[in-house]
Amino acid sequence: IPVIEPSVPELVVKPGATVTLRCVGNGSVEWDGPPSPHWTLYSDGSSSILSTNNATFQNTGTYRCTEPGDPLGGSAAIHLYVKDPARPWNVLAQEVVVFEDQDALLPCLLTDPVLEAGVSLVRVRGRPLMRHTNYSFSPWHGFTIHRAKFIQSQDYQCSALMGGRKVMSISIRLKVQKVIPGPPALTLVPAELVRIRGEAAQIVCSASSVDVNFDVFLQHNNTKLAIPQQSDFHNNRYQKVLTLNLDQVDFQHAGNYSCVASNVQGKHSTSMFFRVVESAYLNLSSEQNLIQEVTVGEGLNLKVMVEAYPGLQGFNWTYLGPFSDHQPEPKLANATTKDTYRHTFTLSLPRLKPSEAGRYSFLARNPGGWRALTFELTLRYPPEVSVIWTFINGSGTLLCAASGYPQPNVTWLQCSGHTDRCDEAQVLQVWDDPYPEVLSQEPFHKVTVQSLLTVETLEHNQTYECRAHNSVGSGSWAFIPISAGAHTHPPDEFLFTP
């Protein structure tokens, strides 16, 4: 650690005195302290001499000697008072800038330690300090305003009592800045804009911050627009607003608009797009397939996206048949607005009944005209199966009718014993009917197919089963020949309630 001579913590001299401060270290040393015009510095290897042969009040201050090569960063200090009866204060800075709630040191150094008892801090022109100003004083450093507030941004003077009168320092301007959490908050309204050529439009860019020192501008396709700025202060925030008014828009007004605000913390920007169109438009679309298939008893939401300008004048969902003249319940129709010009309309169809299959149309209207989007809803059903014994062209025939959607496939099984359903161990024979006859196939209805199994002789201790299946499920019917006549068994689980 360097050593200072004289080896005292503080030195008091009179103006005009010769002062020599010598610092000695192991390596090269350097002095630091308030820059003063009256010092002369002589360095000689491991020692450095700071001297003046005409000390003035401006030499008052703390002088520190450090050894730059010392890894421990040790230093020594001495405080010098030059007690000038006419100049009780040496002010080291004319402006002090702090953030709110920080301590603000006003660096007016007392030139004579004897005066400490009569010091005070005042605002310029002798005005008293604001209420709740909490401060302390150090003759080496000056006055500290603790936890400074924005409202305490003032010009201050240090006052000392000399011979019964108050002697003031030059003024120190304190700037207390609000703690700025980040760049200004921004809004750009609207978020999107569409206008027909010749209509009026307005775009508003506004920024706000706790501190007044910020800039805001609006730019169109990277060109900064010259717009008068309106300023305001409310809710403890400064606001700056730029309003672009266009009386008659044209295509050159279209494009990207960016609202940009910046302060010491950085920059924020937000953008919107302005579309200028020749005439009104209305577009309907859906992310769903317009042909829908749903299992009976399940639910379905039909969604339509609408893009329109100007806004819609009317819209509704309509059921176009073919089963009944019922119309969708309004409570099941739902509209959500994604943004100003895009909306989603949803029709909820819970627990679909057979009579609700068919066409559903969404219709919308705006000044551009009517548009419609139609969905076709087909219900899926698991197969229903029935088997009868009959004679066709004199041959004994088992006739299986299966009804469902999608079109069922048919398989015949012959198994030993009497059973409601053939299991693998009992199966004697299996016949697949790849091309059953389609008896009916109308849009939105079940498909009914018929499969024939010609049987020369009915074996009485056997069961003939017709099985049908599709993507929804399966159904079967067991036919048991008995001496008193054919007997049929639909399986228990076939009891179906949609």
Epitope: P35, P37, H38, T40, Y63, T66, G73, V96
Partner: antibody
Amino acid sequence: QVQLQESGPGLVKPSETLSLTCTVSGGSISSYYWSWIRQPAGKGLEWIGRIYTSGSTKNPSLKSRVTMSVDTSKNQFSLKLSSVTAADTAVYYCARLTVVGALDYWGQGTLVTVSS
Amino acid sequence: QSVLTQPPSASGTPGQRVTISCSGGSSNIGSNTVNWYQQLPGTAPKLLIYSNNQRPSGVPDRFSGSKSGTSASLAISGLQSEDEADYYCAAWDDSLNGPVFGGGTKLTVL
């Protein structure tokens, strides 16, 4: 060895604010006084102001437009010069100010041009 | 217009001794110490002399400074080609409460 490095935009539009930062390495910023100096092309040096942790003192000819601050956590000090004109076009230097008022360590300088 | 006055140019041949003058007033050179800076082309100024006649470490003893009243001078002996640079005098100014500079002297080594 103390080193200083200026940084900031090289081009500023008239009437806007010039902002520069000086980063100090090889020494603690809180132990010394620091200065900003500028030099228009082909001309002499002009002192802008000095700053240390407790405050600043500015050249009276620029006082109303100058703001200086210190960030000890980053070992940086900064200069802001508002309402700039073409006359503010210069190379801006940061430097350390010694106890005898000499500028012993300088940054390499950064050219700031004021133009629209 | 600089506060301190220097000749705009000076010249000399290698090995020669040249002197650059600097004059000021009572609020600067008259009451405070003088510093000199050397600025090589395209570089930042470098402290050459402080406290009227003190050289920072690394500055050759060919460079020396002196002060008398409100004037100061920088002498360079044994002139070398690498000494070709701009030289600025500076002094603390009491009214400015900061340093003032001369307009600079361009030294040419012929």
